[in-house]
């Protein structure tokens, strides 16, 4: 029987800068029941606080609700693992909520084949930002990426759309059924999951010349 091994806070994510959750990985348990507590203070403060919510994020997590989340302030946190034989502490983790946003996928993905008479035909893709993200305040800049492939192909073709919420693709294989998905990323932060796939049948007379 031994003191617990060193835990590690390995991930923090926020859906929208208003709340966030951090997860830790326990060290070895030393063969005894082990209790974990996460403590934190904000940059410039000395007062330590305990995790406000160990439940919402699931096992080995700490959730910070709206009233505990402030932007532009670094949180300095650590996890303490304790059993009957002793304690061990994780390294301190510095967290700025602005940098850990992982939004939901974009919404309302619409795909259409456009065949103007005077110009080349193209695939027109349009989407909306995720609902939790408030783009109007200017706090967020979302970048978008599109991927598409013929249904039976193995490789995805990826296009970076920047901040646009619509995109045109010219080079497609006529007669093929394509899968199209989009994802988004804040200027600082993490890519969302890919949106559910939308299917589009490219007409056989779709010409690229």
């Amino acid at each position: 029987q031994l003191p617990p091994g060193k835990p590690e806070i390995f991930k923090c994510r926020s859906p929208n800068k208003e709340t966030f959750t951090c997860w830790w990985r326990p060290g070895t348990d030393g063969g005894l029941p082990t209790n974990y507590s996460l403590t934190y203070h904000r940059e410039g403060e000395t007062l330590m606080h305990e995790c406000p919510d160990y439940i919402t994020g699931g096992p080995n997590s700490c959730h910070f609700g709206k009233q505990y989340t402030s932007m532009w302030r670094t949180y300095i946190m650590m996890v303490n693992a304790t059993n009957q034989m002793g304690s061990s502490f994780s390294d301190e983790l510095y967290v700025d909520v602005t940098y850990i946003v992982q939004p939901d996928p974009p919404l309302e993905l619409a795909v259409e084949v456009k065949q103007p008479e005077d110009r080349k035909p193209y695939l027109w893709i349009k989407w909306s930002p995720p609902t939790l993200i408030d783009l109007k305040t200017g706090w967020f800049t979302l970048l978008y990426e599109i991927r598409l492939k013929p249904e039976k192909a193995a490789e995805w073709e990826i296009h970076f759309a920047g901040q646009q919420t619509e995109f045109k693709i010219l080079s497609l294989h006529p007669g093929q059924k394509y899968l199209v998905q989009v994802r988004c990323k804040p200027d600082h932060g993490y890519w969302s999951a890919w949106s559910p796939a939308t299917f589009i049948q490219i007409p056989s007379d779709f010409t690229m010349n």
Epitope: V95, Y99, Y190
Partner: antibody, heavy 120, light 107 residues
Amino acid sequence: EVQLVQSGAEVKKPGSSVKVSCKASGYTFTTYWMHWVRQAPGQGLEWIGEIDPSDSYSNYNQKFKDRATLTVDKSTSTAYMELSSLRSEDTAVYYCARNGGLGPAWFSYWGQGTLVTVSS
Amino acid sequence: EIVMTQSPATLSVSPGERATLSCKASQYVGTAVAWYQQKPGQSPRLLIYSASNRYTGVPARFSDSGSGTEFTLTISSLQSEDFAVYFCQQYSSYPWTFGGGTKVEIK
């Protein structure tokens, strides 16, 4: 204990490429951005670029955008920096540096440095 | 890009005295400034982040004041291990840039 261990010194000819490695240990590799910084002999520090090991998303200093390529191998917790079209002015110590936290770009852990000498 | 200008290039100080190092940014950077110490043959070591916050394990004799464009690193009472080169760095906008360094040497 967090450690960043870099590959050994390299001597390269002008026009060639060099690939420097940085093996991370003591923490979860995918949690923190990794940066590359260089220091010419007797000079200051110059930021080359950064990479998020979780998804390989990277940002570069425009000065190096066409010549530097940052990659990671998650299976071995190793970051790489390749610099092509080498010239004598690229002679420098190249450092990998780990982001200080989940936040802005200040660097709390540094590799020991890799000296790259470019000479004909 | 934002240019960080450090002065003086060299500072001669006696042990136990106070050292004051200056760093000026060519554009507003808020408090997005870090300070590093580098000794010969070694990698840089982080001292201060967000302009005024000492990193874990950094002695209290190191402090920074300033925001916007002008920053000052103060070492209140120089110890023998403090003689080194000090760099400031801004992380307000890409590309992240460093000052040219100030060498603190024994007087």
